[in-house]
């Protein structure tokens, strides 16, 4: 009596159970009463990641440099390519289908968290006593110079964008 269900890693065809092709291989011809399933390895830039009866392998993902992408991990006959962003860029989605340039923090703001391949720069306003005079994706807010420790006095107050200006103390005449 012909089977109605097959074991794991098998499939039912023409009333008989045939072996599935292993990951990394595609189906060329189904088994018969006298022959085994015929499978063939996937070619260059192709993969299949499961036991299968596919007649065509899937194409590896292309990491398009025009979208800021590069290969992080080459695909194999059993795995897809993994893309990541070039340095200075980060993915726009979890699937990392394209990248955008890391945001820079404007003067008056410092970097709270440096961007990664998957997250953008996080900026924070420089609090009183700190400043940032550059637009940067790396620079934190810097503390104002302490004039007192240099035996100087503040000649011009600092802001969130500028450092204090120190000067000599007035001499007593």
């Amino acid at each position: 009596e012909p089977p109605t269900a097959c074991r794991e890693k098998q499939y039912l065809i023409n009333s008989q159970c045939c072996s599935l092709c292993q990951p990394g291989q595609k189906l060329v011809s189904d088994c018969t009463e006298f022959t085994e399933t015929e499978c063939l390895p996937c070619g260059e830039s192709e993969f299949l990641d499961t036991w299968n009866r596919e007649t065509h392998c899937h194409q590896h993902k292309y990491c398009d440099p025009n979208l800021g992408l590069r290969v992080q991990q080459k695909g194999t006959s059993e795995t897809d390519t993994i893309c990541t962003c070039e340095e200075g860029w980060h993915c726009t989605s979890e699937a990392c289908e394209s990248c955008v340039l890391h945001r820079s923090c404007s003067p008056g703001f410092g970097v709270k968290q440096i961007a990664t391949g998957v997250s953008d720069t996080i900026c924070e306003p420089c609090p009183v006593g700190f400043f940032s005079n550059v637009s940067s994706a790396f620079e934190k807010c810097h503390p104002w110079t302490s004039c007192e420790t240099k035996d100087l006095v503040v000649q011009q107050a600092g802001t969130n964008k500028t450092d204090v200006v120190c000067g000599p103390q007035d001499r007593l005449r």
């Epitope: 260059e44 292309y62 990491c63 398009d64 440099p65 800021g68 992408l69 590069r70 290969v71 991990q73 080459k74 194999t76 006959s77 070039e86 340095e87």
Partner: antibody
Framework: QSLEESGGRLVTPGGSLTLTCTVS????????MGWVRQGPGKGLEWIGT??????TDYANWAKGRFTISKTSSTTVDLKMTSLTTEDTATYFC???????????????WGQGTLVTVSS | AFELTQTPASVEAGVGGTVTIKCQAS??????LAWYQQKSGQPPKLLIS???KLASGVPSRFKGSGSGTEFTLTISDLECADAATYYC???????????FGGGTEVVVK
Amino acid sequence: QSLEESGGRLVTPGGSLTLTCTVSGIDLSTNGMGWVRQGPGKGLEWIGTIRVTAGTDYANWAKGRFTISKTSSTTVDLKMTSLTTEDTATYFCARGHANNDAYVYFNLWGQGTLVTVSS
Amino acid sequence: AFELTQTPASVEAGVGGTVTIKCQASQSIDRYLAWYQQKSGQPPKLLISYTSKLASGVPSRFKGSGSGTEFTLTISDLECADAATYYCQSYFTSDDANSFGGGTEVVVK
């Protein structure tokens, strides 16, 4: 399509040197490039690769002392610092098979330029 | 660290004969292996990529095979022009893994 390396010469230990690879008939905006060296009587040694985006990757031993950069639409430079006698070799530039990957095979090579590090 | 071991270092065979060169990777590199031929005083020339894909203009006497960690280059019907040093190269991933084998000198008698 051709590649030509230049800039190889005698340099003293501790010195620096920049080699230039000039390409003809090759579009550096669509081709990755690499540098490979070969010591006298020795085998081939990968130095690093530059992708079309100008992103670079280096062999672990080359990190910090070797820098690859695209200097024009037809030239790629290899800057070498803190040179030692072990860096004496013929330096080849070569076209990589991929434009978005650091790890490539090379399907077109220049003739090479000789760098000798000696006091 | 990743290593690519090529054997033998040197091999000799007569015209019309066959030589086999082996390349062993210390970890799986799928099929990301290339073979080059280098004649004295010349740059290397690509023969084979992705284990078995012949480069343009390379005769079918050159045959690459293998996958994972074990690879072979077979040259059949040897000609005098095949006298050269042959290198394998992994181009998988990791800063160490884009390395070349030590080379095999083929001497044709």
